[in-house]
Interface confidence: medium
C-alpha cells in the first residue's frame, strides 16, 4: 500500500505563438482545479476507461479575474498535494491522466459551471520510494508543469511497496535475518529473496523474485557473460563499463554449466550450481515440471506432472525463449516512421505519433501546421488534421500567397464606391449614407441612426473600414 | 575501471558540521547502493551510512542517526554526508564504498577515503 | 546490533604456511528463506582501503587468488590463507551485512 502524489507547480500559456485567451474574464470569474486518474501498466487505455490504480480531485483554486488587455497570465493554483491512494504492490509503470477544469463563478443559474480546460496524459515508469520526478506536458497552447512521486505507508518498503516491516521482537534489535526499517526505527526488515536460480555472484534483486544482472552478465538468471570484440585483457571482464569477457584458459571460462547454473573453480576442475530443476556435472539433467513453475512472464505450461515428462511453455505475446524469458524488443526495428515514438506494450506494438502524423505506424501525413507557414503575415491554425492559415488583410488563398481584392465581395451597401487601400478597403457612400460599410442611412433631419459621428467627419464622408 | 573520489574532509571544530562528497566514474552509479564506512586512526572499520539506488531508501547506525545524512544524486553519479552536529568521537577516515548489487549484498568496491578531524 | 568477534588478534606464519582466521557472530547471519549466510571478508594494507575477498561467506571475489577460501555457516566462519605470500600480510575483518552492518575488530597477519 501507498500514495501516489502529484504537486501542480504552474498552468498557463505555453511557449510560441498563438497565446491562448484567459479563461476568466471581469464578467466571468473562474478558479481551477485538477482531477488526475492513474492506471497500471502502459495502458492505452480511452480517457473514459476506469482509473483502476485510483483518482483524485483538488480542491478549488483562488478565484481569478482577467485583467483587461492583459495576457493570459500563469493561473492561481489550488493549494496541497493530489493524493491517489493505493492498496496493492505499485506497478512500477503507470499511465495518467490531469484534467484542468475551470469553475465558472458568475450568475449561472443552479450554481457554478464546470467546463474541461486541458487534458495531458502520459506512460511513465517509477519506483516508490525515490525522489520527485519532474514533468512538463502540452494540451494545445496550455502548459501544465508538475512533480509526481510514490511512496509506501508503513508497514510496506521497497520500490513496489511490496516488502513489509514487522514490529521487533525485542525493543533493542531485530531478530536474526532481519535488518531495521527505515525510516521505521522500531521495526524490522528481512532480506530479499532473489529469483530462484539468480546467480550469486553476477545477480541482485531489490524486489522479491527478481534477477537484476551486474554489468558484464546477462539471462535470465545472470549467468551468461557479455562478450565484446574489443576486450584488450586475456581473461576476465576488463572493465565495469564494457563488460568485456573473453575466454580463456579458466575452468570456468565460456560457462559450461547449461540452464543457468553457476559456475565456481575448484583446485582441479570445476563446479556446477544448478538451479532447482536440474542436475547433473553440468545441469544438463531437467527434472523439471509444470508444478515447479518454470514459465516466467504469465507463460502457460503444458506437460505432465510426473518427473518423466518435458514440459512446454506457451508466452504470451511479447516474450520468447524456452521459459518465457526473453522479452522481446519489438522496437529495436524502428517501426514507428516520422520520428514517432515506439511503445512495447507486451500484449501490443503501439506508434505514439508526432504532431502533424498519424496511423498505427505513423506513416500519414496529417499536412498540418508542423513545418509549414503561412505567407504574407498569416497564422497557421490547426484543427482536424488539416492546416488553415488565418491570412492577414488584403491576402488571401491556402497559404497567403494571393493578394485578396477586399472590394470584390461589394461590401459597400446602398451603391457605396469600394476603393482597395493598403489596410483593407475604404467605402464611399451615396449621398444619405454613411458608415464603415454605408450602412446606416442619413436621417431627413439631418440626425444620423447612429448615437454620434466621429469629431470632424461629415454624414456622406468615405469611412475607412479597418 | 571503478573509482570512487572522496572529498570533503578537513578540520572543525565539535558542533560543527561537513559534508563529504564521492564521485563515482566506471560503472553506472544509478544500479547500485552505496555506503560510507568510517575508520578511526589506529582502529577497525565502522559502517556509518547506506542509501540504496534510487535514493529512497536510507540507513543509519545507531552512533550517527539523527546527525548524519546520506544521500545521492544520480545525474551527477556522486554521492554525498551531511554531517552535523560532530564529536570528537567521529574523527576518522571516511570512505565511499559501492555494494555488489543493492542494499543486502556486500561492499566489493572503496574510495582512498577522505579524513575528517574533530578537535578544539 | 549483531556483535563480530575475530580470533586470534593477531597472528603470525611463515611463508608457504597455511594462515586461519576465525570469525564468531552473537546471532546467526544465516538467513533461512534463501540460505546464504550474510558474511564477507576483507584484506586491508596500511595506507590502503579495504580489499573485499570473500562474500556469502564463500563466494571468493573475482580477481583474488585462490588461495584464499571461506567456510562456515550459521555463526562460525573461518578465512583460511592456504599458503602464505609475502603480499598477504594485511589486518582481515569480516564483516555482517544481515542485520544492519557490523565488522570484527580486525586480525593482524604477520610474517613468522
Known amino acids: 500500500a501507498g500514495v501516489f502524489e502529484l504537486q501542480i507547480h504552474s498552468f498557463g500559456p505555453g511557449p510560441g505563438p498563438g497565446a491562448p485567451r484567459s479563461p476568466c474574464s471581469a464578467r466571468l470569474p473562474c478558479r481551477l482545479f485538477f482531477r488526475v486518474c492513474l492506471k497500471p501498466g502502459l495502458s492505452e487505455e480511452a480517457a473514459e476507461s476506469p482509473c483502476a490504480l485510483g483518482a483524485a480531485l483538488s480542491a478549488r483554486g483562488p478565484v481569478y479575474t482577467e485583467q483587461p488587455g492583459a495576457p493570459a497570465p500563469d493561473l492561481p493554483l489550488p493549494d496541497g498535494l493530489l493524493q491517489v491512494p493505493f492498496r496493492d504492490a505499485w506497478p512500477g509503470t503507470f499511465s495518467f491522466i490531469i484534467e484542468t477544469w475551470r469553475e465558472e463563478l458568475g450568475d449561472q443559474i443552479g450554481g457554478p459551471a464546470w467546463s474541461l480546460l486541458a487534458r495531458v496524459a502520459g506512460r511513465r515508469r517509477l519506483a516508490a520510494g525515490g525522489p520527485w520526478a519532474r514533468d512538463i506536458q502540452r494540451a494545445g497552447a496550455w502548459e501544465l508543469r508538475f512533480s509526481y512521486r510514490a511512496r509506501c505507508e508503513p508497514p510496506a518498503v521497497g520500490t513496489a511497496c511490496t516488502r513489509l516491516c514487522r514490529p521487533r521482537s525485542a525493543p533493542s534489535r531485530c531478530g536474526p535475518g532481519l535488518r531495521p526499517c527505515a525510516p521505521l526505527e522500531d521495526e524490522c526488515e528481512a532480506p530479499l529473496v532473489c529469483r530462484a536460480g539468480c546467480s550469486p555472484e553476477h545477480g541482485f534483486c531489490e524486489q522479491p523474485g527478481e534477477c537484476r544482472c551486474l554489468e558484464g552478465w546477462t539471462g535470465p538468471l545472470c549467468t551468461v557473460p557479455v562478450s565484446t570484440s574489443s576486450c584488450l585483457s586475456p581473461r576476465g571482464p576488463s572493465s565495469a563499463t564494457t563488460g568485456c569477457l573473453v575466454p580463456g584458459p579458466g575452468p570456468c571460462d565460456g560457462n559450461p554449466c547449461a540452464n543457468g547454473g553457476s559456475c565456481s573453480e575448484t583446485p582441479r576442475s570445476f563446479e556446477c550450481t544448478c538451479p532447482r530443476g536440474f542436475y547433473g556435472l553440468r545441469c544438463e539433467v531437467s527434472g523439471v515440471t509444470c508444478a515447479d513453475g518454470p514459465c516466467f512472464n504469465g507463460g502457460l505450461c503444458v506437460g505432465g506432472a510426473d518427473p518423466d515428462s518435458a514440459y512446454i511453455c506457451h508466452c504470451p505475446p511479447g516474450f520468447q525463449g524456452s521459459n518465457c524469458e526473453k522479452r522481446v524488443d519489438r522496437c529495436s526495428l524502428q517501426p514507428c516512421r516520422n520520428g514517432g515514438l515506439c511503445l512495447d506494450l507486451g500484449h501490443a506494438l503501439r506508434c505514439r505519433c508526432r504532431a502533424g502524423f498519424a496511423g498505427p505506424r505513423c506513416e500519414h501525413d496529417l499536412d498540418d501546421c508542423a513545418g509549414r507557414a503561412c505567407a504574407n503575415g498569416g497564422t497557421c491554425v490547426e484543427g482536424g488534421g488539416a492546416h488553415r492559415c488565418s491570412c492577414a488583410l488584403g491576402f488571401g488563398g491556402r497559404d497567403c500567397r494571393e493578394r485578396a481584392d477586399p472590394c470584390a465581395a461589394r461590401p459597400c451597401a446602398h451603391g457605396g464606391r469600394c476603393y482597395a487601400h493598403f489596410s483593407g478597403l475604404v467605402c464611399a457612400c451615396a449621398p444619405g449614407y454613411m458608415g464603415a460599410r454605408c450602412e446606416f442611412p442619413v436621417h431627413p433631419d439631418g440626425a444620423s441612426a447612429l448615437p454620434a459621428a466621429p469629431p470632424g467627419l461629415r454624414p456622406g464622408d468615405p469611412q475607412r473600414y479597418l | 575501471e571503478v573509482q570512487l573520489l572522496e572529498s570533503g574532509g578537513g578540520l572543525v571544530q565539535p558542533g560543527g558540521s561537513l559534508r563529504l562528497s564521492c564521485a563515482a566514474s566506471g560503472f553506472t552509479f544509478s544500479s547500485y547502493a552505496m555506503s560510507w564506512v568510517r575508520q578511526a586512526p589506529g582502529k577497525g572499520l565502522e559502517w556509518v551510512a547506506a542509501i540504496n539506488s534510487n535514493g529512497g531508501n536510507t540507513y543509519y547506525a545507531d552512533s550517527v542517526k539523527g546527525r548524519f545524512t546520506i544521500s545521492r544524486d544520480n545525474s551527477k553519479n556522486t554521492l554525498y554526508l551531511q554531517m552535523n552536529s560532530l564529536r570528537a568521537e567521529d574523527t576518522a577516515v571516511y570512505y565511499c564504498a559501492r555494494h555488489r548489487g543493492g542494499f543486502y549484498y556486500a561492499v566489493d568496491y572503496w574510495g582512498q577515503g577522505t579524513l575528517v578531524t574533530v578537535s578544539s | 546490533d549483531i556483535v563480530m568477534t575475530q580470533s586470534p588478534d593477531s597472528l603470525a606464519v611463515s611463508l608457504g604456511e597455511r594462515a586461519t582466521i576465525n570469525c564468531k557472530s552473537s546471532q546467526s547471519v544465516l538467513y533461512s528463506s534463501n540460505q546464504k549466510n550474510y558474511l564477507a571478508w576483507y584484506q586491508q594494507k596500511p595506507g590502503q582501503p579495504p580489499k573485499l575477498l570473500i562474500y556469502?561467506?564463500?563466494t571468493r571475489e573475482s580477481g583474488v587468488p585462490d588461495r584464499f577460501s571461506g567456510s562456515g555457516s550459521g555463526t562460525d566462519f573461518t578465512l583460511t590463507i592456504s599458503s602464505l605470500q609475502a603480499e598477504d600480510v594485511a589486518v582481515y575483518y569480516c564483516h555482517q551485512y544481515l542485520s544492519s552492518r557490523t565488522f570484527g575488530q580486525g586480525t593482524r597477519l604477520e610474517i613468522k
Open positions: 556469502w561467506a564463500s
